[in-house]
């Protein structure tokens, strides 16, 4: 939701955890605010406190559960609400209802591993983290690899349009040092986004042989 | 469908208060927040004050501690409170009903149902 100077924005992880920025222009640094999460049809309600993440942003995670606990589904609505502090009361600053499943964003994928790596190709793995079951097989992933001398804004991405946790990178370089990220999106969701880009992964290609081209 | 009509606009005095109703009919179950606009000539609406269900409100600066949003459940009724009113207050006033709420600072985004408006004058 926006007003102006004023966003409030929200995702769900799709497990136990709704992460919320709120920013405005123009507010103290100092000013205390907190996002207060009800569910419609559940027993629980969760806060927590925004802290500064940027000169005109606050930041915080409605940690609703364990990690990998199912706390929301498909047909649950939350009503999130932003108050902040300003001298003895607190004011109301937005109010959204949120549809969790509408607003997805995945963490990160993690445990990325070289499963094989030779001259010209590197196979390589990883895991989803806290990704609910409703999914299935219903996600897609993006890769990109860092090529020496080059920014990752200039690396191409590859799409994997399905669940695939590997990957083939083929036509490298031999000898040569490479970094390779991931990130992943539940098809599911009107405002659903790319999780974060994970952890990079340091991997080098093995040296051609002598007298040979591999 | 929800229909909206508003009343209680009129002509006041700088420094007075008026009183906004607004009548809402139709499937009311449906809705989850409700709120005020308001329009002068060759201008954007302005999003003012709007309530949930559960009754929190926000407002925008404009009206902060001026304004008050009240709904009636019973009644089926929406209010807007308007005290230490300003020529600036001068405008065309809307009722308006969201199926979900998205609101920052008395600002609907997404209005699902507006009413026709009533005019509200402020003279000094």
């Known amino acids: 939701a926006v007003n102006g100077t004023s966003q409030f924005t929200c995702f769900y992880n799709s497990r136990a955890n709704i992460s919320c920025v709120w920013s405005q222009d123009g507010a103290l640094q100092d000013t205390s605010c907190q996002v207060h999460a009800w569910p419609d049809r559940r027993r629980w309600n969760q806060t927590c406190e925004l802290l500064p993440v940027s000169q005109a942003s606050w930041a915080c995670n409605l940690i609703l559960g364990a990690p990998d606990s199912q706390k929301l589904t498909t047909v649950d609505i939350v009503t999130l609400r932003v108050l902040c502090r300003e001298g003895v009361r607190w004011r109301v600053m937005a109010i959204q209802d949120f549809k969790p499943f509408e607003n997805l964003r995945l963490m990160a994928p993690i445990s990325l591993q070289v499963v094989h790596v030779e001259t010209h190709r590197c196979n390589i793995s990883w895991e989803i983290s806290q990704a609910s079951h409703y999914f299935e097989r219903h996600l897609e992933f993006e890769a990109r690899t860092l090529s020496p001398g080059h920014t990752w804004e200039e690396a191409p991405l590859l799409t994997l349009k399905q669940k695939q946790e590997w990957i083939c990178l083929e036509t490298l370089t031999p000898d040569t040092q490479y970094e390779f990220q991931v990130r992943v999106k539940p098809l599911q969701g009107e405002f659903t986004t790319w999780s974060p880009w994970s952890q990079p992964l340091a991997f080098r290609t093995k040296p051609a042989a002598l007298g040979k081209d591999t | 469908q929800v229909q909206l009509q508003e009343s209680g606009g009129g002509s006041v005095q700088v420094g007075g208060s008026l009183r906004l109703s607004c009548a809402t009919s139709g499937d009311t179950k449906s809705i989850r927040c409700m709120g005020w606009f308001r329009q002068t000539p060759g201008k954007e609406r302005e999003g003012i004050a709007a309530i949930d269900r559960e009754g929190f409100a926000t407002y925008a600066d404009s009206v902060y501690d001026r304004f008050t949003i009240a709904q009636d459940n019973a009644q089926n009724t929406l209010y807007l409170e308007m005290n230490a009113l300003k020529p600036e207050d001068t405008a065309m006033y809307y009722c308006?009903?969201?199926?979900?709420?998205?609101?920052?600072?008395?600002?609907?985004?997404?209005?699902?149902?507006w009413g026709k408006g009533t005019q509200v004058t402020v003279s000094s």
């Open positions: 308006a009903a969201q199926n979900m709420c998205r609101v920052v600072r008395g600002a609907m985004t997404g209005v699902d149902y």
